[in-house]
Amino acid sequence: EEELQVIQPDKSVLVAAGETATLRCTATSLIPVGPIQWFRGAGPGRELIYNQKEGHFPRVTTVSDLTKRNNMDFSIRIGNITPADAGTYYCVKFRKGSPDDVEFKSGAGTELSVRAKPSAPVVSGPAARATPQHTVSFTCESHGFSPRDITLKWFKNGNELSDFQTNVDPVGESVSYSIHSTAKVVLTREDVHSQVICEVAHVTLQGDPLRGTANLSETIRVPPTLEVTQQPVRAENQVNVTCQVRKFYPQRLQLTWLENGNVSRTETASTVTENKDGTYNWMSWLLVNVSAHRDDVKLTCQVEHDGQPAVSKSHDLKVSAHPKEQGSNTAAENTGSNERNIY
């Protein structure tokens, strides 16, 4: 009778993570009698996957009933496959021995490759906000995918970006891989509503790439422009001065009126109007009682935006003669203002 051979017909098996892998193995003879064992890897460090004789292997089931006397099919199924299961599996026939069974013949091995989906890309921007015309970096990370081949693209508002660097780690063989990419984006004043998108394409995604997004509203700071104007007389001896705070983002803003350098009033932007580009406008006005002043008055509108150093705009109020009417006041212009008379 010909000597027993252990046949593993599949050189390689490809399985998606979470699925069940079937590793096929048959023997050409029943003798010599003895158990089979499955190992991952070869040599002294090999890992026992299944032992027909003893042990508890909850993820492993046999394809056929190995307790049947004439069984020569030693195929196994491994459930809930993860990338960590990748490797070469050997079906090994032992003959009975004492005190231990003796390895008799090994199959040629089956390489198990695991296809694992990348995790949802996570895009993160800079820790601090930046202003238009500045270049900021965004990072995109995705983990746990296999095989190593992967494609990553960056977009800003649907337009593909070209200034980015991508690394896939580790460089050598691994059960699973991670991708890390850094893109550089130049901010413009119109970017409050903009989005940066990181798109990852992988064989496991069947043409439906994963996307991670970052809103530039979390990154950008658009500093305000200030304009201080003197409005028409409201009543005898009273002048209305407005400070128009335009095109700022985010909303966090504090305004202080100074009268000849002295703090007159401080207020926080509350009822703002939003522009189409996502920036905000706000107006504050100050009612000045001219009769309380003998000399000209220097009114300053000082704005502290989003914790940045204050910017200011001044207006010289002449008190030598009564001002003439300059246009009209509308309710809209006064929205969000607080009337404070200065005496």
Epitope: E1, P32, V33, I36, R95, G97, S98
Partner: antibody, heavy 120, light 107 residues
Framework: QVQLVQSGAEVKKPGASVKVSCKAS????????ISWVRQAPGQGLEWMGW????????NYAQKLQGRVTMTTDTSTSTAYMELRSLRSDDTAVYYC?????????????WGRGTLVTVSS | DIQMTQSPSSVSASVGDRVTITCRAS??????LAWYQQKPGKAPKLLIY???NLQSGVPSRFSGSGSGTDFTLTISSLQPEDFATYYC?????????FGGGTKVEIK
């Protein structure tokens, strides 16, 4: 025909030795192990030991250690069991049995038995 | 060593009866248990291997069950040729051990 044929009955004096043979036919002798089991008159079955017909490894029951030797001759497909320093309580029918389990031990083929009587 | 305890040691039954013999191992032996039938002056004959597998040529009225430490041999309808002594045997590890036997006698 698959069978195990054992040597004939033996009468031995205490202190003597006995060697029982078991010739296999009809199957590949080297593919299986052989166990020896004995049964004293009116008693149950007692396993004595096992030998691999392929590699010659042995495993003996503790109580017989030092007195029993099991061997095989693959050229004649024969297994042997020698028991030394015989005592009267060694009187029994001695069976050879083919061990056929793949990852366990059971005996699917038995010899007819050899009666060994130890008497002064 | 693994001790095998068989019960009952004897049972009286009639043809057609259902007979159950139990065997308990002193420690877990997975499914590595065999049952044998022995008639006077004859060698034992394998009936069941690996706890529940019927040996080739054995009538289907014989069945085995159990795993771990508790095992059962059942003869569903006793026939005249079934009157004999039955032994269980653990095949999990050396030394191999047998139960004390159960004698099935005619009532």
């Amino acid at each position: 025909q698959v069978q195990l044929v054992q040597s004939g009955a033996e009468v031995k004096k205490p202190g003597a030795s006995v060697k029982v043979s078991c010739k296999a036919s009809g199957y590949t002798f080297g593919g299986y192990g052989i166990s020896w089991v004995r049964q004293a008159p009116g008693q149950g079955l007692e396993w004595m030991g096992w030998i691999s017909a392929y590699g010659g490894e042995t495993n003996y029951a503790q109580k017989l250690q030092g007195r029993v030797t099991m061997t095989t001759d693959t050229s004649t497909s024969t297994a042997y069991m020698e028991l030394r320093s015989l005592r009267s309580d060694d009187t029994a029918v001695y069976y050879c049995a083919r061990e056929a389990g793949s990852s366990w031990y059971d005996f699917d083929l038995w010899g007819r038995g050899t009666l060994v009587t130890v008497s002064s | 060593d693994i001790q095998m305890t068989q019960s009952p040691s004897s049972v009286s039954a009639s043809v057609g009866d259902r007979v159950t013999i139990t065997c308990r191992a002193s420690q877990g032996i997975s499914s590595w248990l065999a049952w044998y039938q022995q008639k006077p002056g004859k060698a034992p004959k394998l009936l069941i291997y690996a706890a529940s597998n019927l040996q080739s040529g054995v009538p289907s009225r014989f069945s085995g069950s159990g795993s771990g430490t508790d095992f059962t041999l059942t003869i569903s309808s006793l026939q005249p040729e079934d009157f004999a002594t039955y032994y269980c045997q653990q095949g999990a590890s050396f030394p191999i051990t047998f139960g004390g036997g159960t004698k099935v006698e005619i009532k």
